[in-house]
């Protein structure tokens, strides 16, 4: 029989991102001799968990192992058996449950509760379920793609491994969007970053970086529509909407008692005469990114310039990795190319924003209407955050590459954060005598 | 040669408690998920629980039987296992084996060679 | 939690005979079942491990074979000592359960 004592030359481990829409589960495998070499952690399989986000199984957390099943049989059939008791498995909750915790850390902490206790039923080396900061999202997915990129590795090449691969160290700045938060982290260029909160110091195979970061709460896709619709209502005259931002032809009903659940939408609250709304589709982009722009408090910035809301925000720098939803919908617009200028991504959204409903969903028959009927309000919203609320401009637009994969590992938090909590992100340069892991991220 | 020797069986009342101790030798105790399982005269083997390792915070799953009643612990230093038994019934009554697998996981291929637990008033 | 049931509860077979014995899962384990075997005032000894994996040091003549739910132990020619208990066991998913067992006996 195969014995501990001849460990496999492989290694494994398992991230499962516990978004606030849906939960996805990652294997990733390196050689065990390489394991502080740059860029040798590579994805070997994603899976999906069926259903909503982790949050919403709060009143229903009985369902949660349950839930995990498929993913984690299918983790048990992708690694070797031989290798299961040494596979590292983490959870990190995002944003959707920073969002519950708000509301109710009791209520948050039953629910990882139950799904710690999920997770260590499995025969995995089960390390922890938390709810990772905004910060440490963003520095992840920083980590990630500069990973993969092999910008943290001090060889020079003459080639190109990937087609955004600029030959020079430069790092890469992170774009993340995902359901309930969104995420900005890059190296600004000799700019000192005015709010410590902001601020994070890494030493990454014997080089410093000063790297700038913000998540964004409430201003992930979905909560900005939750939160567009919660502004919107109020100025309604009845319960009719008649929305911008939804194709012409398309109607929904809403409850209210779902507009106020978040606590997102709490500084639109207040008491309607009804208890539902119909939220009417007139498809117009121009009119749906005014909408989306009083989101943004641009009237108050406390330091020398800032994204919105208050929020510190440095000059641009470099190149950027979009990820996540940012890539997701502009894939699915068919918007992710390199030669796409910003004025044909606006000229592209105002014509697929003034197609009619039932035209749509003629043409994308295979997907499912609840996200077909967002993918209007979602670019719209994409282009007015990077616009308006980042400061990009049609010529810095360029500098934006929606990377769905580098490859073959998706960009997202889930790589940086196992490579720092696997220690596999020396501070030293390798060949140099080891440091202690204190030094690591 | 690879051993596991149970101690600490014994007559107890109803309600009563007991700690049963594995002393294993002959491989690396700290590096393997250790169980007890349970036979009751003359019927079929029970599962009682599993300790996993340090680097797993010292997991430990039991089965619902014996679920806040009984507890299992380690110490890796004297490559003991322990079982804690508080509020003994009598259909605990059973030989109790520690076992642990040197190969993969939850199968046994080393037993004990158990320790008659007796609970009867 | 997966229940296996073990049939028959006795097989009487003659020595130099082959017996075939039976472990049921209530759901499917892939190929986590293990069997044992046990003497009277012995501790159990593991057979087979995954369904079908032989362990060094056990008899060429017991064998695994099965996947999902149903799962089978066979003796290509039984010996006098072969006269004991066995047991299945699922090794897929905490609780691990054992079958109830079949005693092998002489005819």
């Known amino acids: 029989t195969q014995n501990k004592a001849l460990p496999e030359n492989v290694k494994y481990g398992i991230v499962l991102d516990a978004g606030s829409s849906h939960t996805s589960l990652y294997i990733y495998k390196w050689p065990a001799e390489k394991e502080n070499d740059t860029g040798v952690v590579h994805q070997v399989e994603e899976c999906r968990v069926k259903g909503p986000g982790i949050s919403k199984f709060v009143q229903k957390v009985n369902e949660i192992g349950i839930y995990l099943t498929d993913c984690m049989e299918r983790a048990r059939e992708v690694i070797p058996r031989s290798q299961h008791q040494e596979t590292p498995v983490y959870l990190g909750a995002t944003a959707g449950m920073r969002l519950l915790r708000m509301e109710s850390e009791e209520l948050a902490d039953r629910v990882l509760d139950v799904v710690e206790r999920s997770l260590s039923n499995y025969p995995f080396d089960f390390q922890g379920a938390r709810i990772i900061t905004g910060q440490e999202e963003g520095a992840y997915g920083w980590i990630t793609i500069n990973y993969l990129l092999g910008k943290f590795s001090q060889k020079t090449r003459w080639f190109s491994i990937v087609p955004y691969e600029t030959n020079n160290q430069e790092t890469f700045g992170a774009l993340d969007l995902g359901g309930a938060s969104t995420q900005v982290t890059f190296v600004p260029q000799n700019q000192t970053i005015e709010s410590p909160d902001n601020a994070l110091q890494f030493r990454l195979y014997g080089k410093d970086y000063n790297v700038y970061t913000h998540s964004f709460l409430c201003y992930g896709k979905d909560q900005a529509l939750w939160q567009k619709l919660a502004k919107d209502i109020q100025v309604a005259s009845n319960e009719i909407l008649r929305d911008p931002c939804f194709h012409p032809g398309y109607k929904k009903v809403v409850n209210v008692s779902d507009l106020y659940k978040t606590p997102c939408t709490k500084r639109f609250e207040m008491t309607l005469p009804f208890q539902q709304f119909e939220i009417q589709g007139i498809g117009n982009y121009q009119q749906c990114h005014q909408s989306i722009l009083e989101l943004f408090n641009t009237s108050y910035c406390p330091y020398s310039q800032c994204a919105f809301n208050g929020i510190f925000l440095p000059p641009l720098q470099g190149d950027f990795g979009a990820f996540s939803a940012f890539y997701f919908v502009m894939k699915f617009l068919n918007l992710t190319s390199e030669k796409v200028s910003q004025e044909k991504v606006t000229e592209m959204m105002k014509k697929f924003c003034a197609q009619p409903w039932e035209e749509i969903k003629t043409s994308y028959a295979g997907v499912k209407e609840k996200y077909l009927s967002e993918y209007c309000f979602s670019g719209t919203y994409i282009l007015s955050l990077l616009l308006q609320g980042y400061h990009f401009t049609a010529d810095s637009w360029e500098h934006i590459h929606f990377i769905g994969k580098i490859q073959g590992s998706d960009a997202g938090w889930t790589l940086g954060y196992m490579l720092n909590l696997t220690n596999m992100i020396p501070a030293e340069q390798p060949l140099s005598t080891p440091l202690s892991h204190s030094t690591y991220v | 040669e690879v051993q596991l020797v149970e101690s600490g069986g014994g007559l107890v009342k109803p309600g009563g408690s007991l700690r049963l101790s594995c002393a294993a030798s002959?491989?690396?105790?700290?590096?393997?998920?250790m169980n007890w399982v349970r036979q009751s005269p003359g019927k079929g083997l029970e599962w009682v629980g599993e300790?996993?390792?340090?680097?797993?915070?010292?997991?430990?799953h039991y089965a619902e039987s014996v679920k806040g009643r009984f507890t299992i612990s380690r110490d890796d230093s004297k490559n003991t296992l322990y079982l804690q038994m508080n509020s003994l019934k009598t259909e605990d009554t059973a030989v109790y084996y520690c076992?642990?697998?040197?190969?993969?996981?939850?199968?046994?291929?080393?037993w004990g060679q158990g320790t008659t637990v007796t609970v009867s008033s | 939690e997966i229940v296996l049931t073990q049939s028959p509860a006795t097989l009487s077979v003659s020595p130099g005979e082959r017996a075939t014995l039976s472990c049921r899962a209530s759901?499917?384990?892939?190929?986590?079942l293990h069997w044992y075997q046990q003497k009277p005032g012995q501790s159990p000894r593991l057979l087979i491990y995954?369904?079908?994996q032989s362990i060094s040091g056990i008899p060429a003549r017991f064998s695994g074979s099965g996947s999902g739910t149903d799962f089978t132990l066979t003796i290509s020619s039984v010996e006098p000592e072969d006269f004991a208990v066995y047991f299945c066991?699922?090794?897929?998913?905490?609780?691990?359960?054992f079958g109830g067992g079949t005693k092998l006996e002489i005819k």
């Open positions: 076992t642990t697998q040197l190969d993969l996981y939850w199968f046994f291929d080393v």
């Open positions: 002959g491989f690396t105790f700290s590096k393997y998920w």
């Open positions: 995954y369904a079908s």
């Open positions: 300790i996993r390792l340090k680097s797993n915070k010292y997991g430990t």
């Open positions: 759901q499917s384990i892939s190929d986590y």
């Open positions: 066991q699922n090794g897929h998913s905490l609780p691990l359960t």
